[in-house]
């Protein structure tokens, strides 16, 4: 007694994809295998297969269905923080060359990494033209200010809102300040966190606010303090600058903005006599704490000048380093003061028309605004690197 | 944030026409598809069609090919339902609804119309 | 066109119970990246607010007692513990293919 295995029925390639090999006829464990045209993948049901190959059996049936081949899903695109995404191909379409487009929160937000446009491609990734399948940055625009420069010397004025976005309060143990960077870092002195580094959550910090007493305000909390390794507590105040770290990102507007680090060459907005502005909620001249955001615009002095001021006592020889600037008036009535430390000192860079912060309230004279003496600040621009590695580390 | 607001209550004599608005402010996009949805008292959701005021370019639900009319002006970012040769059937509410992503992102009010004779 | 057939109609749920809501398509809405059913809550008088969206993802502001599932053909809708502001009209929506459809709704009462 024989039999005859039946042969297996001719297998219909499904649409977008072709049978291998092609056979005159499929008959006891021949087999064929489904390949997908680019843009499509191999589906059964909606699971998708790695590859399909069917066995034809002695009874004359394949061992499995045949599968579909269904376009390319890259699926819903992520959202992307502080941006948005529009679809360009047709509502919500998000399948094999579908175009997306991400896009940055105007005014406040600029995106980095490439230019938004992601392609659905054929692995089901949305694919931007630069070949990234991560998504582009939304990163705040820094250094606008409702405030123009007017270059002129006059005393302290009161703040008006968006004239000092980047301006932080820091409250724990004593008040001082800070300036935003990016939105989610504090710079500030290192003297003024000093006792909280290794507490950082004891700092209390507020921003978008005017008023220092203000119920109305933009907490933030820190994650971290990084004081300068080079920093020594009780004994100068060289390398006095540290960051804090906040535990999440602040929503940029009008009232809350970072200020930009300087560039390469912001020496140049930074000479002698060029004109800084400090702002903070320090000692006034009546000598309590302001109760508004109080400014002061302040010109740049030589560096020997500076050195020479602080050579005498009660001041250690070698106080003023080269990692200080001073600024300030000779005939004095003009300066920071206690209560403003870590705040920035600002500059506008006329080539971009963004501020930028060129030192941090460190120290001056006992008595603030005092003629002869000037407010020594740390010179930012010595530090880019140290900032911009913890940063990136962290 | 989006807003969209929809024309007033309609009425009309059956065999007319009607035309509703539906405007957009606030945070609008560039890319987006502006829907029209239909619901009957007490009865579900129908889907009309969509415009994109961007490009044009528009769909339909077969069902409603012959009865609507979408159209855009792109600088009032206001869209626009016309619905032609009216009967009792096409009196209820209808909605415009923004689309970003795969899901309607945002509603109008809804406007109603009236047909009577 | 797809049919998303909803049940039940109606349905009346004590106050801190959980109502479940299904949703079936008449063939696959999904894709091995995504699932294209949203659920939207109408209440009288309103226009619907989108809850859940892709089957599961919670629309921001909507209260974590809604919860979505499914892939395929079968999804549901559940909430829990139900509050008396739950009280509404429940529809699934499939955006998987044009012409989108709309189930025939659930509406829900508290009891």
């Known amino acids: 007694y024989t039999s005859t295995a039946q042969p297996c029925p001719y297998p219909m390639a499904p649409p977008n994809g072709h049978v291998s090999p092609v056979q005159a006829k499929y008959i006891l464990k021949d087999s064929f295998s489904i390949f997908c045209e680019t843009g499509y993948e191999l589906l059964q049901g909606h699971l998708p297969l790695k590859s399909f190959t069917a066995v034809c059996q002695k009874d004359g049936s394949w061992d499995r269905p045949m599968p579909a081949c269904s376009i390319v899903d890259c699926g819903p695109p992520d959202d992307l923080p502080s941006g948005r995404v529009e679809y360009i191909t047709g509502p919500g379409v998000t399948t094999y060359k579908a175009v997306i487009q991400y896009s940055c929160e105007e005014t406040f937000y600029t995106m980095k990494v490439n230019d938004g446009k992601y392609v659905c491609e054929a692995d089901g990734f949305w694919t931007s033209s630069k070949g990234e399948k991560s998504l582009p940055v939304c990163e705040p625009v820094c250094g606008l200010s409702a405030r123009t420069t007017g270059g002129r010397i006059y005393g302290g004025q009161k703040a008006k809102p968006g004239d000092f976005p980047w301006q932080v309060l820091i409250l724990g143990g004593t008040t001082a300040a800070g300036a935003l960077l990016y939105d989610n870092w504090v710079l500030t002195a290192a003297h003024a966190v000093y006792e909280q580094k290794h507490d950082a959550s004891a700092l209390d910090i507020r921003m978008g606010t005017l008023k220092r007493l203000s119920p109305h305000y933009t907490q933030a909390w820190s994650e971290a303090v990084f004081i300068h390794e080079g920093y020594t507590h009780d004994a100068g105040f060289d390398n006095d600058i540290a960051l804090i770290k906040l535990n999440n990102k602040v929503v940029i507007n009008s009232n809350i903005t970072p200020i930009c680090l300087p560039r390469k060459e912001a020496e140049s907005f930074m000479r002698t006599d060029d004109i800084g502005t400090a702002s903070g909620w320090g000692l006034t001249q009546r000598g309590f704490l302001a109760r508004n955001l109080m400014y002061v615009d302040i010109p740049i002095v030589d560096h020997q000048k500076c050195t020479a001021a602080y050579e005498k006592p009660p001041y250690p020889r070698g106080s003023v380093t080269a990692n200080m600037l001073c600024a300030g008036l000779e005939s004095g009535g003009k300066d920071s003061c206690r209560g403003d430390s870590g705040g920035a000192l600002v500059f506008l860079d006329s080539e971009t028309e963004r501020w930028f912060v060129g030192g941090i309230v460190s120290w001056g004279s006992m008595n603030c605004g005092e003629a002869g003496q000037y407010g020594v600040y740390t010179k930012v621009i010595n530090y880019i690197p140290w900032i911009e590695n913890i940063i990136s580390d962290f | 944030q989006v807003q969209l607001q929809q024309s007033g209550a309609e009425l009309a004599k059956p065999g007319a026409s009607v035309k509703m608005s539906c405007k957009a402010s606030?945070?609008?996009?560039?890319?987006?598809?502006m829907h029209w949805i239909k619901q009957r008292p007490g009865q579900g959701l129908e889907w009309v069609g969509y415009i994109n005021p961007n490009t044009g370019y528009t769909d339909f639900n077969q069902k409603f090919k012959d009865k609507a009319t979408l159209t855009a002006d792109k600088s009032s970012t206001t869209a626009y339902m016309q619905l032609i040769s009216l009967t009792s059937e096409d009196s209820t509410v209808y909605y415009c609804?923004?689309?970003?992503?795969?899901?309607?992102?945002?509603w109008g009010q809804g406007t109603t119309l009236t047909v009577s004779s | 066109d797809i049919v998303l057939t909803q049940s039940p109609a109606s349905l009346g749920v004590s106050l801190g119970q959980r109502a479940t809501i299904s949703c079936r398509a008449s063939q696959s809405v999904s894709s091995s990246r995504s699932t294209y059913i949203h659920w939207y809550q109408q209440k009288p008088g309103q226009p619907p607010k989108l809850l859940i969206k892709y089957s599961s993802n919670l629309e921001s502001g909507v209260p974590a007692r809604f919860s979505g599932g499914g892939s395929g053909t079968d999804f549901t809708l559940n909430i829990h513990p139900v509050e008396a502001e739950d009280t509404a009209t429940y529809y699934c929506h499939q955006s998987w293919e044009i012409p989108y459809t709309f189930g025939g709704g659930t509406k829900l009462e508290i009891r």
């Open positions: 606030g945070n609008t996009f560039t890319n987006y598809w």
């Open positions: 609804t923004l689309q970003l992503g795969r899901n309607f992102d945002y």
